[in-house]
């Protein structure tokens, strides 16, 4: 199942960065009735998920970059 | 040793509130959940809501969302639960429990709520 | 929300019997599902999470099974200390919660 049908919060603990060229996607899930913070979660090239720390400038940047390039949702 | 320690009983009067601490020791705070549970005399277990040790970042049941505020402490590993606007019906034992270990990587296994205080009695009397 | 329903509601058994405790979703969980044991004036105590996956420091005669909607917790041969109150639990998602308990007392 997508990570958006989810019903609870999927991210303790956060990376304050991670490598651009590692990663083939990232998604940001607003705050909602199931998760009270904003998550962003990144798909990496070798298939594994990782959280990202959205208050992270890095992280920040990396959303940006992202979303230029169609992989941001 | 690894524990969550809960502050004392404390006897209140309709409309006043209350602040819980459940103090972790032993363990690494930040990847566990901070669950609050409480259990009214002779009842079932009622999940309050919880807190996340980074972010700070509190989950509420509806039931109590106008009510309960959960917040933390990092310098001390402490988290606290304030209810609010008490009845006589908020009389129970408030459990504080933790749930992971979990790092960095988002998953859908969930682990159970392995380590609980020893709860603390909250009356509420006129 | 989620309903757990736990049934029976009290088991009455002597000790060295088997026990068998269900717990039924009212939509599916997954297998995150936990088991927990309570004594009176005690906090609960984390018996099996995940469905199955045992907890260190628990005895082996507890286990558990099921996924979806429907879960069991069995007691292989039940020890004086083992009469108590169980509680499922899901944590699938929140709000989370418990099934209304199974008392186990002794025959």
């Known amino acids: 199942a997508p990570l958006a049908t989810e019903l609870r919060c999927q991210c303790l603990q956060t990376l304050q960065g991670i490598h651009l060229k590692n990663i083939q996607s990232v998604k940001v899930k607003s705050p909602g009735p199931h998760c009270a913070q904003t998550e962003v979660i990144a798909t990496l090239k070798n298939g594994q998920k990782a959280c990202l720390n959205p208050a992270s400038p890095m992280v920040k940047k990396i959303i940006e970059k992202m979303l230029k390039n169609g992989k941001s949702n | 040793q690894v524990q969550l320690v809960q502050s004392g009983a404390e006897v209140k009067k309709p409309g006043a509130s209350v602040k819980v601490s459940c103090k972790a020791s032993?363990?690494?705070?930040?990847?566990?959940?901070i669950h609050w549970v409480r259990q009214a005399p002779g009842q079932g277990l009622e999940w309050m809501g919880n807190?996340?040790?980074?972010?700070?970042?509190?989950n509420y049941n509806e039931k109590f969302k106008s009510r309960v505020t959960m917040t933390r402490d990092t310098s001390t590993s402490t988290v606290y639960m304030e209810l609010s606007s008490l009845r006589s019906e908020d009389t129970a034992v408030y459990y504080c429990?933790?749930?992971?270990?979990?790092?960095?990587?988002?998953?859908?296994?969930?682990?159970?709520?392995?380590?609980w205080g020893q709860g603390t009695l909250v009356t509420v009397s006129s | 929300e989620i309903v757990l329903t736990q049934s029976p509601a009290t088991l009455s058994l002597s000790p060295g019997e088997r026990a068998t405790l269900s717990c039924r979703a009212s939509q599916s969980i997954s297998n995150n599902l936990h088991w927990y044991q309570q004594k009176p004036g005690q906090a609960p105590r984390l018996l099996i999470y995940y469905t199955s996956r045992s907890v260190s420091g628990i005895p082996a005669r507890f286990s558990g099974s099921g996924s979806g909607t429907d879960f069991t917790l069995t007691i292989s041969s039940l020890e004086p200390e083992d009469f108590a109150v169980y509680y499922c639990g899901q944590n699938n998602e929140w709000p989370e919660v418990f099934g209304g308990g199974t008392k186990v007392e002794i025959k």
């Open positions: 032993g363990y690494e705070f930040t990847s566990y959940w």
């Open positions: 807190i996340s040790p980074n972010s700070g970042s509190a």
């Open positions: 429990a933790r749930e992971g270990p979990y790092s960095y990587y988002p998953s859908r296994q969930y682990y159970g709520s392995d380590l």
